[in-house]
């Protein structure tokens, strides 16, 4: 178990032109607050349990009113840390979402108006117990500077808060009741496996399977406080029958459970049973209601205002999870046709189409001639990945928009002269030749050397 702590240092306009002067409008005072959502491992948008490591909401910051014309000051921030308690192991790699919210304090019907100013997300490596890590993130024109760390709650230690720091040597070496026992690393390794049920707070073992009691505790599992009346003289580690010291503190002594939670000892530590409306290792986290703004990404919160009532977040398109903190990967359904690229804009999808396709979902094939015009009497021909125009005589180019010089290719054979004509070209043949392209020699007897005439054509008819 442990606590993730987030310290916001500053939030304000980022560098560069076009940065906003202030998050507040000139007319209305406002104040900022922050929300953090933590997830283990994976990317911040991964489809896994919502804020599985926990979430926290800051207090509201001081009220700020923009003074027109005045230089933009540092925006006043909420006091204190954002703390996210975690019960299990710290994952080492985690993802975070930090949202900056503005609360406008005008005369709106229904109370203050909230709006999401900025949302930053990232994935980081962090060992528990390490120093504060500093970070700067930009969201649009805003810049957020913050530090964070993860620390273990005693008796947990280590980079994942999974090792329990127990005495491995005699208690005299540790001092009664001292749980992390010693700063020496070898004394804070995973404990020996003592007798099953041996009190982790008041018992220890130097050999596997035994359960020796700290002073002030007795019983086979060291769970029974020794009566002070039987204490005769200070001794070392007590047995069930010898004298004792004043009882050492038990895990539930002083009731570590806040907000009316009841404490019960467990084989490893203690457990708080929290009243409705509270949760956390020590019932220190108050119950979340709609008044706390538990819904991320502009989700609509529905539920009562009293701590006993649950809330439900109605998520905007593109988000899901009990707090609307998970982005839905709608593109995984491959909604864009014909190999189009899908972009999830949050409020909608956008398809970017491959060449030859168009439409909101790339559903239109531009290779067919629908909607395409071939100019100057050309005819559209489908196929081949791009539409093609078969152009009328005298025109060329992709869409038959270019005037073609029909004589450029020297189409008239045997020295015939070419003349451009509105309907194409005309060949004026040299003496002794005939045909549309002057391709046939004329015999002196006047008969032409034509191939066999097709039906309906007499030799000598002009061929076009």
């Amino acid at each position: 178990a442990g606590v993730f702590e987030l310290q916001i240092h500053s939030f304000g306009p980022g560098p560069g032109p076009g940065a906003p002067r202030s998050p507040c409008s000139a007319r209305l005072p406002c104040r900022l607050f922050f929300r953090v959502c933590l997830k283990p491992g994976l990317s911040e948008e991964a489809a896994e349990s919502p804020c599985a490591l926990g979430a926290a909401l800051s207090a509201r910051g001081p009220v700020y009113t923009e003074q027109p014309g005045a230089p933009a000051p540092d925006l006043p921030l909420p006091d204190g840390l954002l703390q996210v308690p975690f019960r299990d192991a710290w994952p080492g790699t985690f993802s975070f979402i930090i949202e900056t919210w503005r609360e406008e304090l005008g005369d709106q019907i229904g109370g203050p108006a909230w709006s999401l100013l900025a949302r930053v997300a990232g994935r980081r490596r962090l060992a528990a117990g390490g120093p504060w890590a500093r970070d700067i993130q930009r969201a649009g024109a805003w810049e957020l500077r913050f530090s964070y760390r993860a620390r273990c709650e005693p008796p947990a230690v280590g980079t994942a808060c999974t090792r329990l720091c127990r005495p491995r040597s005699a208690p005299s070496r540790c001092g009664p009741g001292l749980r992390p026992c010693a700063p020496l690393e070898d004394e804070c390794e995973a404990p020996l496996v003592c007798r099953a049920g041996c009190s982790p707070e008041h018992g220890f073992c130097e050999q596997p399977g035994e359960c020796r009691c700290l002073e002030g505790w007795t019983g086979p599992l060291c769970t029974v406080p020794v009566s002070t009346s039987s204490c005769l003289s200070p001794r070392g580690p007590s047995s069930a029958t010898t004298g004792c010291l004043v009882p050492g503190p038990g895990p539930c002594d002083g009731n570590p459970c806040a907000n009316g939670g009841s404490c019960s000892e467990t084989p490893r530590s203690f457990e708080c049973t929290c009243p409705r409306g509270f949760y956390g290792l020590r019932c220190e986290v108050s119950g979340v209601t709609c008044a706390d703004g538990p819904c991320f990404n502009g989700g609509l919160c529905v539920g009562g205002a009293d701590p006993d009532s649950a809330y439900i977040c109605h998520c905007p398109p593109g988000f899901q999870g009990s707090n609307c903190e998970k982005r839905v990967d709608r593109c995984s359904l491959q909604p864009c046709r014909n190999g189009g690229l899908c972009l999830d804009l949050g409020h909608a999808l956008r398809c970017r189409c491959r060449a030859g396709f168009a439409g909101p979902r790339c559903e239109h094939d531009l290779d067919d001639c629908a909607g395409r015009a071939c100019a100057n009497g050309g005819t559209c021909v489908e196929g081949g990945g791009a539409h093609r125009c078969s152009c009328a005589l005298g025109f060329g180019g992709r869409d038959c928009r270019e005037r073609a010089d029909p004589c450029a290719a020297r189409p008239c054979a045997h020295g015939g002269r070419c003349y451009a004509h509105f309907s194409g070209l005309v060949c004026a043949c040299a003496p002794g030749y005939m045909g549309a392209r002057c391709e046939f020699p004329v015999h002196p007897d006047g008969a032409s050397a034509l191939p066999a005439a097709p039906p309906g054509l007499r030799p000598g008819d002009p061929q076009r």
Epitope: R119, R138, A139, G140, G298, P316, P317, R330, P335, G340, L341, L343, L345, G346, H347, A348, L349, R350, C351, R352, C353, R354, A355, F357, A358, G359, P360, R361, L366
Partner: antibody, heavy 128, light 112 residues
Amino acid sequence: QEQLVESGGGLVQPGASLTLTCKASGFDFTSNAMCWVRQAPGKGPEWIACIYNDDGSAYSASWAKGRFTVSKTSSTAVTLQVTGLTAADTATYFCARSPYYTYGGAPSAYASGYFNLWGPGTLVTVSS
Amino acid sequence: DIVMTQTPASVEAAVGGTVTIKCQASENIYNSLAWYQQKPGQPPKLLMHDASVLTSGVPSRFSGSGYGTEFTLTISDLECADAATYYCQSDYYSTGGSYGFAFGGGTEVVVK
């Protein structure tokens, strides 16, 4: 016929605030984003912000965040609120429609990425 | 954000001639390009979207082509009514999650 009409422009002092209104008629307001584009004299259009009518999602240019706020005020009108006006904001402000398309059974709308209907514009002059 | 660069800034051609306007995007936008025509005192008018799809009512003298980062608008058989400024426009979606629109600087077409 389909129409957009802007109003609210005029001569304003530097530092002042202004609210422009765009009224739509002749088409279904839903499944469209209503956008604001401005054009300074002699310059090209510059996109400011849009609001998607189905769910009220607003998105704006990075330079416009903080000073320009787009809102849907009725089933046929959107507004653009501008604060801290300077001479650089002098321009004709256009309201433009960016169509979104929905398909039966599909959970999402699809953005078109272009503006297929524009209003005539309203001129905003910032000068002392 | 994406940057759209148009060339030339101005072009002059005779009636019946052909004009070609180029638009370059700073990143791959696939076919996500629109062209607009704007005359003085009027709002822009959508001519074409998806790089090559003509808007209803726009004459087939206007044609568009291109893909990725390089796009072209061609106006053939120029008419006096084609004298205007032409803008290209695309939408963008940045990795930070912001969606928006960008216009080119414009090309003025003068018809002699």
